[in-house]
Interface confidence: medium
């Protein structure tokens, strides 16, 4: 016997209190699949998060980060502070890369310069805090 709730489309829930009719999701909630017995609360993009896509009755809101921050985690579950190129984020904030390391992005950690001699090459252009060395013949 077919479950009558399976006829309820996305954007509705199957209302058991009303003979399993399909009721529209309340404001600020959604159901992305059919046959649901409740709707889900919309994600709210607050504080350092900002709304990239509004919630609809059939899909959740999507967030990104305000300027000066970038997304981390699945679905932008966290926002992390940007640093300048040549820096990395530590517990004490943005710190310059140590000598011999670089970071060419606003996120991530400082990485060691390439060791040209390992490939039998010499340094053509010296590295900086923002750029890796360029190896030459």
């Amino acid at each position: 016997l077919q479950d009558p709730c399976s006829n309820c489309p996305a954007g509705t829930f199957c209302d058991n209190n009303r003979n399993q009719i399909c009721s529209p999701c309340p404001p600020n909630s959604f159901s992305s699949a059919g046959g649901q017995r409740t709707c889900d609360i919309c994600r709210q993009c607050k504080g350092v998060f900002r709304t990239r896509k509004e919630c609809s009755s059939t899909s959740n809101a999507e967030c990104d980060c305000t300027p000066g921050f970038h997304c981390l985690g699945a679905g932008c579950s966290m926002c992390e502070q940007d640093c300048k190129q040549g820096q990395e984020l530590t517990k004490k904030g943005c710190k310059d890369c140590c000598f011999g390391t670089f970071n060419d992005q606003k996120r991530g950690i400082c990485r060691p310069w390439t060791n040209c001699s390992l490939d039998g090459k010499s340094v053509l252009v010296n590295g900086t805090k923002e750029r890796d060395v360029v190896c030459g013949p």
């Epitope: 209302d15 999701c25 309340p26 609360i41």
Partner: nanobody
Framework: EVQLLESGGGLVQPGGSLRLSCAAS????????VGWVRQAPGKGLEWVSA????????YYAESVKGRFTISRDNAKNTLYLQMSSLRAEDTAVYYC???????????????RGQGTQVTVSS
């Protein structure tokens, strides 16, 4: 026991106004997310308007924006829907509803009243 009693419906000409009331008992309106749903003849339920986040924000369906205004009187534990510039397509039974948040994040709603009929016709 939770009860919601709607009133204020009637027959009105296109362009006219009505104010619907919903007297609540068994719970405190000001502490809940509440609103209005309607059911037009031969159609499904539709959310019209709601007061959410304990009054922090309001919701209006696109079809009623700028024409309907939701409000509540906490002292009287009553919810209102001021309807103006009414159109034939606003003809429906209007129900007062309370949003219900379930453990685990699910959301449904509850409407217990008989509704109030609004008919817009010349």
């Amino acid at each position: 026991e939770v009860q919601l009693l709607e009133s204020g419906g009637g027959l009105v000409q296109p362009g006219g106004s009505l104010r619907l009331s919903c007297a609540a008992s068994g719970f405190t309106l000001s502490a809940e997310d509440v609103g209005w749903v309607r059911q037009a003849p031969g159609k499904g339920l539709e959310w019209v308007s709601a007061i959410l986040d304990s009054g922090g924000s309001t919701y209006y369906a696109e079809s009623v924006k700028g024409r309907f205004t939701i409000s509540r009187d906490n002292a009287k534990n009553t919810l209102y829907l001021q309807m103006s510039s009414l159109r034939a397509e606003d003809t429906a039974v209007y129900y007062c509803a309370r949003v219900v948040y379930h453990a685990g994040g699910g959301v449904t709603y509850d409407y217990r009243g008989q509704g109030t009929q609004v008919t817009v016709s010349s």
